[in-house]
């Protein structure tokens, strides 16, 4: 049985040209986190492997950087980042947990971090 | 259009090193982590390790991790794989490799370098 | 390690027919899998990876299938050219493994 839960920052906000920090936590699981996977929409950003350390997807490597932890860093915000991003988690022997972000660029100097908080998981189970 | 060209044969006396080098073309080589790996006669192939061009950082495969050292330079966009204390079994075509867009398999090759190591 | 098996070993097929190909891995390893072509004398080429997405410039007469630990390389109607020795491998942890290979030939 999948008994853990992710715990995201949740809804967020950074300004055009800034940096924000990708965070996700897995928590109430003793599971082994072996990959996590962020992506954008359908599209891979990057891959943090427990044995073979980071792939970062081609397209974004100039501007996404690998860390803190296992979290992501997007760097040169445009607006066009605006949106839903997923850490999805791969545990053995659990499987699959998902986290979902939503990021917000702004154009005016008013970005706040939204506060963090916990959502539901969702999970597929291999 | 991506190209993988790599330096020639070489054959080797057991304990000896080898130095094979890998130079890639067609695309921003920083961008794409490079892998190595290799083929005996007749044997599977065996991945070896990669790096990631742009900050130099390496991850390689414990059977090999005491004496293989992959490197790279960036001004000329050629990776590097230094085998020491070779012997006999190491005897085989070895491989660069670039890694694909979406994880870590390999979308395009080298043609090879042949190392023979012999008495 | 990751074991990698692969079956059959060696397969003839007419052209035109349908060649299938499986793998089985021994742990799980999700979607984490991908495909590689070897012609006599040449460097593998990638077909396919995370199991089922065919790699650019590759014919739609292949394609992959599977998750978890059993995987099929498919290909529907044969050609001269894909005589070949087909690999899979897992891309999903260290150390990076291949199957054995399975040769493919014309009946």
């Known amino acids: 049985m999948m008994t853990g839960t992710i715990e995201t920052t949740g809804n967020i906000s950074a300004e055009k040209g800034g940096s924000i920090i990708l965070q996700c936590h897995l928590s109430s699981t003793t599971a082994q986190v072996t990959q996590v996977n962020w992506e954008q929409q359908d599209q891979l950003l990057a891959i943090c492997n427990a044995d073979l350390g980071w792939h970062i997807s081609p397209s974004f490597k100039d501007r996404v950087a690998p860390g803190p932890g296992l979290g992501l860093t997007l760097q040169s915000l445009t607006v066009n980042d605006t949106g839903e991003y997923f850490c999805i988690y791969h545990t053995y022997p659990d499987g699959t947990y998902t986290g979902r972000i939503f990021l917000e660029v702004l154009e005016s100097s008013v970005a706040e971090h939204g506060a963090r908080f916990q959502i539901p998981h969702h999970h597929h189970h291999h | 259009e991506v190209q993988l060209v790599q330096s020639g044969a070489e054959v080797k006396k057991p304990g000896a090193s080898v130095k094979v080098s890998c130079k890639a073309s067609g695309y921003t080589f920083t961008n794409y982590y490079m892998h190595w790996v290799r083929q005996a006669p007749g044997q599977r192939l065996e991945w070896m390790g990669r790096?990631?061009?742009?900050?130099?950082?390496?991850k390689y495969n414990e059977k090999f991790k005491s004496r293989v050292t992959i490197t790279v330079d960036k001004l000329s966009s050629t990776a590097y794989m230094e085998l020491s204390s070779l012997r006999s079994e190491d005897t085989a075509v070895y491989y660069c490799a670039r890694e694909g867009h979406y994880g870590f398999y390999s979308d395009y090759w080298g043609q090879g370098t042949t190392v023979t190591v012999s008495s | 390690d990751i074991v990698m098996t692969q079956s059959p070993d060696s397969l003839a097929v007419s052209l035109g027919e349908r060649a299938t190909i499986n793998c089985r891995v021994s742990e799980n390893i999700y979607s984490y899998l991908a495909w590689y072509q070897q012609k006599p004398g040449q460097s593998p080429k990638l077909l396919v990876y995370?199991?089922?997405t065919l790699a650019e410039g590759v014919p739609d007469r292949f394609s992959g299938s599977g998750s978890g630990t059993d995987f099929t390389l498919t290909i529907s109607s044969l050609q001269a050219e894909d005589v070949a020795v087909y690999y899979c491998q897992h891309h999903y942890g260290n150390p990076l493994t291949f199957g054995p290979g399975t040769k493919v030939d014309i009946k």
């Open positions: 790096i990631d061009p742009d900050s130099g950082g390496s």
């Open positions: 995370n199991a089922k």
